[in-house]
């Protein structure tokens, strides 16, 4: 019967006793940077070309005996997971292997850098179709390795990497911490994070998504028909490389940003038990398990958005945190979050010709996060409209006044350490959805966008009694672009988007007491693109 991992990534409409997705990734070449491989294993023979690239350190220990099957174990298994004819994800994808890990699975940053350069040169000499580079390795944070990944990604190559098996923040490792790389954590058959001895999968904001990574059946280098079960984030990354190959084979013109957004969009949502992660990492770690799209075509009409968390600002009074979108993405809204609740809001600002989301810590605060909502919006023209503090009792307001511009997000930022929270919340006058409303002592920032066929609406959910969390979701066919809290409550820790749901978090109810100021309202801005939908219908 079908291995659990292949069943897990397969949408229900393709489920059968055998895994036979519609397109095997035949137009895509996957580069594997790993150990040597047993290329004559019947699972991968004829599918994997072993390049002459080899850059590995000496094995440790004088008593180490090289045994071919052990040297090839990791790479052979991963090649099988990506494109194996029996237990592979992208059965049609061709692969090229580069040896950057020795027989003990150890490599060097320099060896990996030279390997990436080898791929870049190969791409220049003989341009082929879409390229996916699988980096099933993790080492300490390396600015130079991250930069090399960025260069290759900007040349149009899709890089997929393992989050690492250290039960730690993936941002502390490379290439997992490189924003341009698709970083993959590992889950098991129960959709739980993978435990590996005393350690396990890495987690945190640098992980893009999770994928099957425990008891993964694949080619064993022991013999030509041998199979073995292996576990780890390398196996998880191999699944995503295979899914990426299939998506790119179906839509070869997809950019890295489009591919990443699709991987996120088609993932299984909220299936991972977050209790496994350290408490401070739960909100930062995506609750996503990779899956193939239900159809390889026709996703183009959707407005895709993802949430990008910044690094923690640190606790100093003037500390700020910045969240950035990828080059091909539009920043449609900006929010902030602080566990202590002490923050001075957030704002969108231009940096290097592109909008970024900046959050501000407050005196006595333990630090803040900036949260960017990054979307794919072709032909978009977005700008930020700001209203300074109003000082009037009605609060601060700003709206999108340009013709054809719609409101996609609201941010508020204040200089005072503590807003006058004794005032009741300001309510938005009905029939004026195209404006942001904020506290009178705050400056308000409206993200206003013009794009063909773009329409947005505001959706609110208010709870009169204090609650630790208030949510409001966009309905089917609409995409969450903006998430904020209505002003006037002291205990709001911040707001952030989780998939298509806006989450407003408050302080522990027991500490705030149940006063009239306890009301919390979550405000979602939901958008869709009629233009993209029409374009899609014309193509079909």
């Amino acid at each position: 019967s079908i291995p659990w991992n292949l069943e897990r990534i397969t949408p229900p409409r393709y489920r059968a006793d055998e895994y036979q997705p519609p397109d095997g990734g035949s137009l895509v070449e996957v580069y594997l940077l790993d150990t040597s491989i047993q290329s004559d294993h019947r699972e991968i023979e004829g599918r994997v070309m072993v390049t002459d690239f080899e850059n590995v350190p000496e094995e440790d220990g004088t008593r180490f005996h090289r045994q071919a099957s052990k040297c090839d174990s990791h790479g052979t298994h991963l090649a099988g997971v990506v494109s194996g004819r029996d237990a592979g994800v992208a059965k049609g994808a061709s692969m090229r292997s580069l040896r950057v890990l020795n027989c003990q699975g150890k490599g060097t940053v320099s060896g990996t850098l030279i390997g990436l350069e080898f791929i870049r040169k190969s791409q220049l000499v003989q341009p082929v179709g879409p390229l996916v580079v699988l980096l099933p390795l993790a080492g300490g944070y390396s600015r130079v390795l991250n930069a090399a990944c960025q260069r290759l990604a900007r040349a149009g190559v899709v890089l997929v990497t393992a989050a690492g098996n250290f039960r730690d923040d993936a941002c502390l490792y490379s290439p997992a911490s490189a924003p341009e790389v698709i970083t993959v954590g590992a889950t098991n058959a129960q959709d739980q994070p993978v435990t590996l001895g005393t350690l396990g999968t890495n987690f945190g904001r640098c992980v893009d998504l999770f994928a099957p990574g425990e008891d993964i059946i694949g080619a064993s280098s022991d013999c030509s028909t041998c199979f073995v079960s292996q576990s780890g984030t390398s196996q998880a990354a191999a699944h995503v490389a295979g899914i990426a190959a299939m998506m790119l084979s179906a839509e070869p013109e997809l950019t890295l940003a489009e591919l990443r957004q699709r991987l996120i969009h088609f993932s299984a949502k909220d299936v991972i038990n977050e209790a496994w992660f350290p408490e401070d990492q739960r909100v930062l770690t995506p609750n996503l398990v990779a899956a193939l799209p239900p159809s390889t075509h026709g996703a183009g009409w959707q407005l895709f958005c993802r949430t990008v968390w910044s690094a923690h600002s640190g606790p100093t009074r003037m500390a700020t945190a910045v969240a950035r979108c990828a080059p091909d993405e539009e920043l449609l809204s900006c929010s902030s979050f602080s566990r202590s609740g002490k923050r001075r809001g957030e704002r969108m600002e231009a940096q290097g010709g592109k909008l970024v989301c900046r959050a501000h810590n407050a005196f006595g605060g333990e630090g803040v996060y900036a949260i960017a909502r990054c979307c794919l919006l072709p032909q978009a023209n977005c700008s930020v409209h700001t209203a300074p503090p109003a000082e009037a009792s009605m609060g601060t307001r700003v709206h999108c006044h340009q013709q054809g511009h719609v409101l996609t997000g609201c941010s508020s930022h204040w200089e005072v350490e503590d807003l006058g929270t004794h005032k009741p919340p300001v309510l938005r006058p009905r029939g004026q959805p195209n404006q942001c409303v904020g506290h009178r002592e705050a400056s308000i920032h409206a993200s206003c966008c013009h794009a063909p066929g773009l329409e947005c609406k505001v959706k609110e959910h208010g709870i009169p009694a204090p609650q630790e969390q208030v949510t409001v979701a966009c309905e089917e066919g609409w995409t969450l672009t903006g998430c904020s809290a209505l002003p006037g409550t002291s205990h709001v820790l911040g707001a952030y988007a989780v998939d298509n749901t806006c989450v407003v978090r408050s302080r522990d109810v027991s500490t705030t007491g149940s006063t009239s100021e306890g009301a919390v309202t979550a405000v979602a801005i939901c958008c869709r693109s009629r233009h993209l939908a029409q374009a899609s219908q014309e193509l079909q």
């Epitope: 006793d17 004829g46 022991d222 041998c226 079960s229």
Partner: antibody, heavy 119, light 113 residues
Framework: QVQLVQSGAEVKKPGESLKISCKGS????????ISWVRQMPGKGLEWMGM????????SYNPNFQGQVTISADKSISTAYLQWSSLKASDTAMYYC????????????WGQGTLVTVSS | DIVMTQSPDSLAVSLGERATINCRSS????????????LAWYQQKPGQPPKLLIY???TRESGVPDRFSGSGSGTDFTLTISSLQAEDVAVYYC?????????FGQGTKVEIK
């Protein structure tokens, strides 16, 4: 039920070409390997080679490489063994058999095709 | 290539008696990654195709009578018919399926004494 059905016996002259077939049914044909096994009169079993119908990947026993061609048409769940120029020494019973990655032994065999090459 | 050698070439056993066939491979077919022996046993009766009896050296195929058993590991294997029946008259082959080319033993002919 799961079965492999082979084409009928053939009598040929040396130098002639021949293509025999093996049709699978009752299972997902593209997800199993099909091997061909020769048994010369009164002799043992010799593995000739195999094909994976899913992508037409083939692997041959070096003793048979260049002597025969293994192919498949997955649209009709059929594998083939062919000779471009038969020799008298090709006289034998030919069996097809299937195997799977999780069970890499021959669990189902065809009934056999007797090929007689004589002038 | 892995060479498979069976002994004896032929064997005559009385009905109800035990029949033992040995098979030796020129290199080990036991693999550490899954601790399995990549060895199978087949039975071929006159005018019929071979039939799978035992795989992974000791696992009986469904529908095969329990008088048939396989044992051994690494390079030395045994097929045992605990109580020979008239319908067991056949040629028995061992086969390694770990590396290509796949190879069979030369066969052992079992007859009734």
């Amino acid at each position: 039920q799961v079965q492999l059905v082979q084409s009928g016996a053939e009598v040929k002259k040396p130098g002639e070409s021949l293509k025999i077939s093996c049709k699978g049914s009752g299972y997902s044909f593209t997800n199993y390997y099909i091997s061909w096994v020769r048994q010369m009169p009164g002799k043992g079993l010799e593995w000739m080679g195999m094909i994976y119908p899913g992508d037409s990947y083939t692997s041959y026993n070096p003793n048979f490489q260049g002597q025969v061609t293994i192919s498949a048409d997955k649209s009709i769940s059929t594998a083939y063994l062919q000779w471009s120029s038969l020799k008298a020494s090709d006289t034998a019973m030919y069996y097809c058999a299937r195997d799977h990655w999780s069970k890499p032994f021959f669990d189902i065999w065809g009934q056999g095709t007797l090929v007689t090459v004589s002038s | 290539d892995i060479v498979m050698t069976q002994s004896p070439d032929s064997l005559a056993v009385s009905l109800g008696e035990r029949a033992t066939i040995n098979c030796r491979s020129s290199q080990s077919v036991l693999y550490s990654s899954n601790n399995k022996n990549y060895l199978a046993w087949y039975q071929q009766k006159p005018g019929q195709p071979p039939k799978l009896l035992i795989y992974w050296a000791s696992t009986r195929e469904s529908g095969v009578p329990d008088r048939f058993s396989g044992s051994g590991s690494g390079t030395d294997f045994t097929l045992t018919i605990s109580s020979l029946q008239a319908e067991d008259v056949a040629v028995y082959y061992c086969q390694q399926y770990s590396s290509f080319p796949i190879t069979f033993g030369q066969g052992t002919k079992v007859e009734i004494k």
